[in-house]
Each structure stands twice: as C-alpha cells, then as structure tokens.
C-alpha cells in the first residue's frame, strides 16, 4: 500500500522536511503533489511525468519544493503555514490512479525565556512572590528549577497559568535561592538566566558574646552582638536601660564593680521595620586578697607532732581549697579538714609530709593560690647503715668504715668498739689491722632536735682464714624458658676471689650463664630443666679458701606432651583396658581422662574391665601444671572388635 512518511514529523521554522514515499507502484505514468487531504487542482504544488522527466509547478508551488524521481518531495525553509496535510496522486500506465496522504507540523524555534517577578524584596512570613516565565508562547511547555533541581513538593509552592507562573506563598529566608524557568516545544528547549530571590527577614533575637557574665575588677569588657537579618541589622547598646552607642561591639576598658548591670543589645532592620533585643546581666567582682598559710608548728617531729595549717585571711561565705605537691588532697586518715575547710591538720606527721602545701580562695571566677609552704619535719635518725658491707678482713689492711642514717637535722655520729666509745665522727679509720681488731663495731646516730638515737652493730672479723660461704637466690622456683635466677655468694669479703661449680665441675661456657659483681653473682638466663643441678660457690684469698654447701635449683617445667601406654589401639572384646599416661613435669602434673569428650577420672591410670565395642572411641589424657600455668593433652583412638574376629594389634 502506498504510504507517505514525513521526516521529521515536527519541523522547526526555517528547516526542511522530506515527504518520503513508500511502496510506489510499478509502471507509472506520473504523479502530482497537492496541499491538503485531497486532490484539488487549485492546490497542486507540482506534477511530474516520468517519460519526459518533466516537473511542472502548480498553483500552490512556492519555489521551495523539490520533487524527486522516486516521488518524494523536499520542502525547504519551512514556514508556519506549511503545517498540514500533503497528498500524492499517482497515475499508472493503465490509467488507474492511487492516492496517499502524509502530514507534518511546524513549530517555531523558541526564544530564551526570562523571569518577571511581582515582588523584588518580599518580607519573610508575610509576602508572597509570583514568578512568571516570559514570553507567552503557544504550544510550549513551562518548567521551573530551584537551585538547578526540580521543584520540591511544598504547600507553599503553586503553579498556575499553564505552569507559566510559580507562586511562593509566605516566603521564608530559606526561599532565597536561584530560580530558572524553561520553555519546551517539540523542536526546542530553552532555559532562562537565574533569578535570585532576595527575602527580607529578621532581625532574629540577637546573641551576645562571649557568654561569660562574670568579670574581675580591672578587666576589659568587650561585648559583641549579632542577629541574623537581611539586610544586615543596625545595632544599639543600652546599659541599665540607658542608650550607650550604635555599634555592633561594646568596649569598656578597666571595669569596676560599678559596671555591673543589665546590658541590652537592640538589633533593627530598616527594611522589615522590626526590632529585637537581648539582655545579659554582667557582674563585676572586686579582686580578693591573695591568701597565705600560717602554721602552728614550724618544726614538727615525725610520728609525734600534729601540724595545723590555716588559710588566711578569714572571709565569710568563701570556699577554701588545699593542694599538696600540686595535687588535690589525697584521702588519708592522717589528713583532717575543719568544717569550713580553712584549716588542714596533719596528724602524726611523717618525713613525706614536707609538701609543698598551697591553699586557695575560690570566688565566682577563679581560684587565688597562696605561695607554697614547706614543712620542716624533724625525723630520724633511722637505723644507721655501715659501709662497706665486708665483714671479713685480712690482717695488715686498713679498716675504713662509714656510717649514715637518714635524719633531719643531720645526725651526729659516734663509734664504739666492743661497747667502748672511740670517736664522734661519721667515719672510723684504723690502719694496719690485726686479729685483735676483731669485734663488735657500733655506730650510734643521734638527732639533737628530736633527742632520738639509733645504733647498728657490725661484726668485723680480722683473720687470714675465710669463713664458709653460703648461696642466696632471688628465685627459688623459676619456670623453664621464662625466668632467670641470680645466685649470690655470701658474705662479701675484701680482696677475695669468688668461684663457682655446677655438679662439681667448673662453670660451662654458655650465653645463658653470666658472672657479675666481681664474680660474686651468677645469673642463669631463661632457665631450663637441665639447670636443676647442684651449685656451689667458693671464696679464696692468698692464704685460705672455702666452699659453700650445694644449692639445688628447683626448676618448674612442663607438662610436656603426654604419652599413653601401651601403644596398642586395637583390642578384643572381653579384654581389660589399662591405659597409663605420663608427662614430664615439675611439680608432677594433675592427670585427667576424657572418653569421647566426656570427663572421667583424675588418675594417671585408666582401667576398664571387660571392654566391649561400646568402648570404642577417643581416649584423651589431659595434664595440667598450675605452677607453670601450662596444660597439655594427647588423644588416642581405641577400637574394640567382637571376640570372633582377631585384628592384629597395631601401634
């Protein structure tokens, strides 16, 4: 069937359109194009005779039409009047005619639209604004964009006039945005430039900063006011109701108590005609005096005296605070505060109570600290220490002993030998000693302020013979692969060589063995169970030698992975099952058994008489050593066969 296709169907003014013919019959004589839906000689555009290839214009020919041999018609420079129907009349050789009608629509190219507004400065919560998209164009669709997004759904937004008008009711400051309109028809789409809505609002209630309302006498007062407003607000300050100045900031230097009062900021918007105010109450406090501490006892005696520290001056309705060593007061039954916190009493002072102590007076703004006070606690003397620690000396050497005892004021020292006073010095020196200088050497320390004295006695032996040494240890039960052990050979003796033996042999070379302190200390790092041996130390000088009794190291280890015996895993029904578990461990491990995960007994041997196939399963032995904190286990599968069959025993 003969058909006409318009390409395109919607045509922009000034463009061209092709009326394309489909299914053109064979053996044609010629054809004619007509404007309209029927053949009308008055409206013929053009005729075409195939035999002569001659095109003849008709009454409706405009000079913009071109006919093609395939009967298609091209119309150029389309105008609005070209819209409508076009009919093709085909004359066949047998003089039988055929007709077909096609059509197209002509639309104008749209101009760039613009937005007009009925209110350029609407007031928030009061005015409405109507935007209209210009120009008004027939057959055009109107669209709106806010901040390049399609219109939000809002009861305050309304489209009218074929969507050409957008109305915003009761505008708010949030409606301050970029608005665009767009016109569309089948052949074009154009967007307007942005229109920014300028909503007048405010002023909101102003905020005064800083929020601080308490000041000290002598400080500067600098208040700033801000209120959200469009256009920006004009500000005025009032103090106690009296106008001060029309500025956003209020500055008063070197304020006094008289500057206390109510400070009002007024914000005014000349376009909306609105005023808003905020009031803040400012309090100016007089500078309090600097506190100081008085003490009822400037030289207290340790463990005897109490000291009462008082914070001066006494001020009514004031909070007193205390610090010791720059920290708040520790909780201690020896520290007592009076009801008003003004007096701090230290019961039974100790040397650690020296301080420093500070008190503070708290007002509404801050805390004023006193100067620190340090207590002069009289203490001691403690038990004196005599050095060096040697107790054995060889004849002919010099004996030089020094005594020291912690004491405040420093102790006075006296030396006695076998109870007889020698001298009042901190050091005792005797040259070229002999066996007769053996004896009890007493150092007496005396504190003249407290009247206390303490003594320490040291036995000095002057002999060519060395005593029998002994071994002390810092860890009697070390854990394998974890602990170190330090053995020390006692006593410390002058001009003495220290030696060590392990299991009667001299020390082996090992990175885990280290001698220090003049060979007097033997350290075993990362002990192992093999270190559980007999250790002996020896001392010798040029005239004698002696050995200690052996010390055996008790190394805690294990439990190692247990072994279940016998190794058999296959049994005949009716046999006795007797499993024994063993794990190397010190102390001996705690044993326990599980059969198929179910706890059984805590014995080393698991015995089950006359087993059956029901005893098939996994037998687990668990070992635990609480001393090393370690556990271990092993699982063995047991298969019990009915007595008729005889599987070989397998390991």
């Amino acid at each position: 069937k003969l058909t006409i296709e318009s390409t395109p169907f919607n045509v922009a003014e000034g463009k061209e359109v092709l009326l394309l013919v489909h299914n053109l019959p064979q053996h044609l004589f010629g054809y004619s194009w007509y404007k309209g839906e029927r053949v009308d000689g008055n409206r013929q555009i053009i005729g075409y005779v195939i035999g002569t290839q001659q095109a003849t214009p008709g009454p409706a020919y405009s000079g913009r039409e071109i006919i093609y041999p395939n009967a298609s018609l091209l119309i150029q420079n389309i105008i609005q009047n070209d819209t409508g129907f076009y009919t093709l009349h085909v004359i066949k050789s047998d003089l039988v005619n055929e007709e077909a009608t096609g059509q197209f629509r002509v639309y104008p190219e749209l101009p760039k639209p613009s937005i007009s507004s009925n209110n350029s400065k609407p007031v928030e919560d009061k005015d409405a604004v109507a935007f209209t998209c210009e120009p008004e164009t027939q057959d055009a669709t109107y669209l709106w964009w806010v901040n390049n997004q399609s219109l939000p759904v809002s009861p305050r937004l309304q489209l009218s006039n074929g969507n050409r008008t957008l109305t915003l009711f009761n505008v708010t400051r949030n409606d301050t945005a970029s608005y665009k309109c767009e016109t569309q028809n089948p052949v074009s789409a154009r967007r307007s430039d942005s229109v920014i809505l300028n909503v007048l609002y405010g002023p909101d209630a102003p905020t005064i900063s800083p929020l601080n309302t308490s000041y000290r006498s002598g400080e500067n007062l600098n208040l700033s006011c801000h209120a959200a407003s469009n256009p920006p607000a004009q500000y005025s300050w009032f103090v106690n109701g009296t106008f001060q100045q029309s500025t956003q900031e209020l500055f008063i230097p070197n304020i006094t108590v008289n500057n206390s009062g109510s400070y009002t900021c007024q914000a005014h918007n000349s376009d909306t005609g609105l005023n808003r105010t905020t009031v803040t109450t400012i309090t100016v406090y007089a500078e309090p005096p600097k506190p100081f501490i008085t003490s009822n006892n400037s030289n207290p005696v340790e463990d005897e005296d109490a000291v009462a520290l008082t914070c001066e001056p006494e001020i009514q309705n004031t909070t007193y605070l205390w610090w010791v060593n720059n920290q708040s007061l520790p909780v201690s039954p020896r520290l007592q505060l009076s009801n008003d916190n003004r007096t701090l009493t230290l019961l039974s002072v100790t040397r650690n109570d020296v301080g420093p102590y500070e008190c503070g007076i708290q007002n509404e703004l801050s805390v004023d600290h006193s100067d620190p006070v340090i207590l002069n606690v009289l203490y001691g003397p403690d038990d004196p220490t005599i050095s060096p620690s040697y107790t054995y000396y060889r004849p002919g050497v010099n004996l030089s002993l020094s005594c020291h005892a912690a004491s405040n004021p420093p102790a006075q020292y006296s030396w006695l030998i076998d109870g007889n006073i020698q001298q009042h010095t901190q050091e005792l020196f005797i040259s070229n000693i002999t066996e007769k200088n053996s004896g009890l050497y007493t150092c007496q320390a005396n504190n003249s302020a407290s009247g206390h004295s303490r003594t320490t006695v040291k036995t000095i032996t002057v002999s060519a013979e060395l005593p029998k040494p002994s071994i002390s240890s810092n860890n009697s039960k070390p854990v394998e692969d974890k602990d170190a052990v330090a053995f020390t050979c006692e006593p410390e003796a002058q001009n003495t060589t220290y030696l060590w033996w392990v299991n009667g042999q001299s020390l082996p070379v090992s990175p885990r063995l280290q001698l220090s302190n003049g060979n007097r200390t033997l350290t075993l790092f990362n002990v192992t169970r093999n270190d559980a041996r007999a250790y002996v130390c020896g001392i010798q000088n040029s005239v004698s030698a002696n050995r200690s009794d052996p010390v055996t190291l008790d190394v805690l280890y294990g439990p190692d992975t247990p072994i279940i015996s016998p190794p058999d895993s296959s049994y005949l029904s009716g046999a006795n099952l007797n499993l024994s578990c063993h794990s190397a461990s010190n102390p001996s491990p705690q044993y326990s058994w599980r059969i198929n995960g179910i706890p059984q007994q805590h014995t080393q041997v698991l015995f089950i008489a006359k087993i059956t196939p029901n005893n098939n399963g996994t037998y687990a032995c668990f070992v635990s050593n609480l001393a090393t904190g370690r556990n271990n286990s092993i699982v063995k599968s047991i298969t019990v066969s009915a007595s008729g069959t005889s599987p070989g025993l397998s390991a």
Epitope: P587, Y591, H602, V605, L626, A627
Partner: antibody, heavy 120, light 107 residues
Framework: QVQLVQSGAEVKKPGASVKVSCKAS????????LHWVRQAPGQGLEWIGY????????NYSQKFQGRVTMTRDTSTSTAYMELSSLRSEDTAVYYC?????????????WGQGTLVTVSS | DIQMTQSPSSLSASVGDRVTITCRAS??????LAWYQQKPGKSPKLLIY???NLVEGVPSRFSGSGSGTDFTLTISSLQPEDVATYYC?????????FGQGTKVEIK
C-alpha cells in the same frame, strides 16, 4: 558409689599401738592414693601420710616418721594405718580419705572416722 | 613445710549475707588450694580444688579465688545449712597442711 568404711573406735594405753582399717568400694582401689588425716577433739585437721595402693609406696609426715606404718591389701581393697608408741596427745578421730586424682590433688571422699582414745 | 593461715577464726552472719574467708600460704603454692566444709560430728567434705574449681554437686553460691599465696572462699548468700567449720588445704606436694579452720554461725 564411692565409700570408705573405717573400723570402730579404740581405747589404748600409752605406749601401745593401734591399727585402723579403711575398706574401699565403688571405685578401682589401686587407681587412687589413700591418705590418713587426724583431728584431735575440738582441733583442726592434721595430715599423717599416704599410701599408693598400686605400688605400696608410702609418704609420711616428718612428725609421724618412725611411729606410723601404712599398708594395704588389694585383694580386699582395704588400707591400714598403724600408729605405735601411743601417747595421750594421739587421742583423735582418724580419717582415711581418697585423693581426687594422682599428684597434687585434694581429698574428695572421706571415711566416717575412727575415734582412738589413749588413756591410762 | 608450708604453713596455712586462715582468717577469721570464727564469724557470725545473717541468712542471705555475703561471707568471705581468707587463707594465706607461707610460700607460693600457685593454684594448688582446696576448701573443705565440716559439720559437727561429720567428716570433711571437699567444696573447691585448684583454688577455684567447684566440685560437682556443690551449690553455686560457693566460689573460690586467688593464686600464689592469698586465697578466698566466698559464700554469696549464706544459708542455714552452711553452718559449719571451713578449712583450707594446700595440695602442692607433701606434706599436705590445713588451715586452722573458720567457724561460720548464723546470727
């Protein structure tokens, strides 16, 4: 269920000996070690020693060394504790107790106790 | 020998009270500590071993804690049937030694 049943009360003169028995049932006698503990009237508990019924190995407290003998009869699942050279301070209730397992375990089952009175 | 020191030697508390008994060893016994309950005229009964393991059948109001040298037996809510003397015992090698006991009574 596990039970330890002890022999009856005894009255002995100073210098004499006493032998207390403890019959075990409800478990494999040779698997668990048996301890002996005594308690003087109104006093606390005092450990005397233990026997390994499987091997007969014994371990006595130093205090009772030389005066105590622990034995067992595996055929009757019975343990015995004999204390010689009795003195008045040996007056006490003597308990046998099973160790919960082997090595470094506490005592989970106790006999009902046997009162031994030493009096002239 | 390892000495075991129990405290207090006696205490009196009301039904529902939380009761705590402490036991101190003279040297490190790690976790090898047991607690026993002995009612008048009866044999001791094992409550706890390895310092914190509750023996099967013992009410959960009994609990043990501690390691090294300091141990605690706690009865979370004392019941009339808990009136007894409680002993601690170390089971870290022989000789086994017991604490002197703590007598618990109801007020």
């Amino acid at each position: 269920q596990v039970q330890l049943v002890q022999s009856g009360a005894e009255v002995k003169k100073p210098g004499a000996s006493v032998k207390v028995s403890c019959k075990a049932s409800g478990y494999i006698f040779t698997s668990y070690w048996l301890h002996w503990v005594r308690q003087a009237p109104g006093q606390g508990l005092e450990w005397i020693g233990y026997i390994n019924p499987n091997t007969g190995y014994t371990n006595y407290s130093q205090k009772f060394q030389g005066r105590v003998t622990m034995t067992r009869d595996t055929s009757t699942s019975t343990a015995y504790m004999e204390l010689s050279s009795l003195r008045s301070e040996d007056t006490a209730v003597y308990y046998c107790a099973r160790e919960y397992g082997n090595y470094n375990y506490p005592l989970d089952y106790w006999g009902q106790g046997t009162l031994v009175t030493v009096s002239s | 020998d390892i000495q075991m020191t129990q405290s207090p030697s006696s205490l009196s508390a009301s039904v529902g009270d939380r009761v705590t008994i402490t036991c101190r060893a003279s040297e490190n016994i790690y976790g090898y500590l047991a607690w026993y309950q002995q009612k008048p005229g009866k044999s001791p009964k094992l409550l706890i071993y390895n310092a914190k393991n509750l023996v099967e059948g013992v009410p959960s109001r009994f609990s043990g804690s501690g390691s090294g040298t300091d141990f605690t037996l706690t009865i979370s809510s004392l019941q009339p049937e808990d009136v007894a003397t409680y002993y601690c015992q170390h089971h870290y090698g022989t000789p086994y030694t017991f604490g002197q006991g703590t007598k618990v009574e109801i007020k």
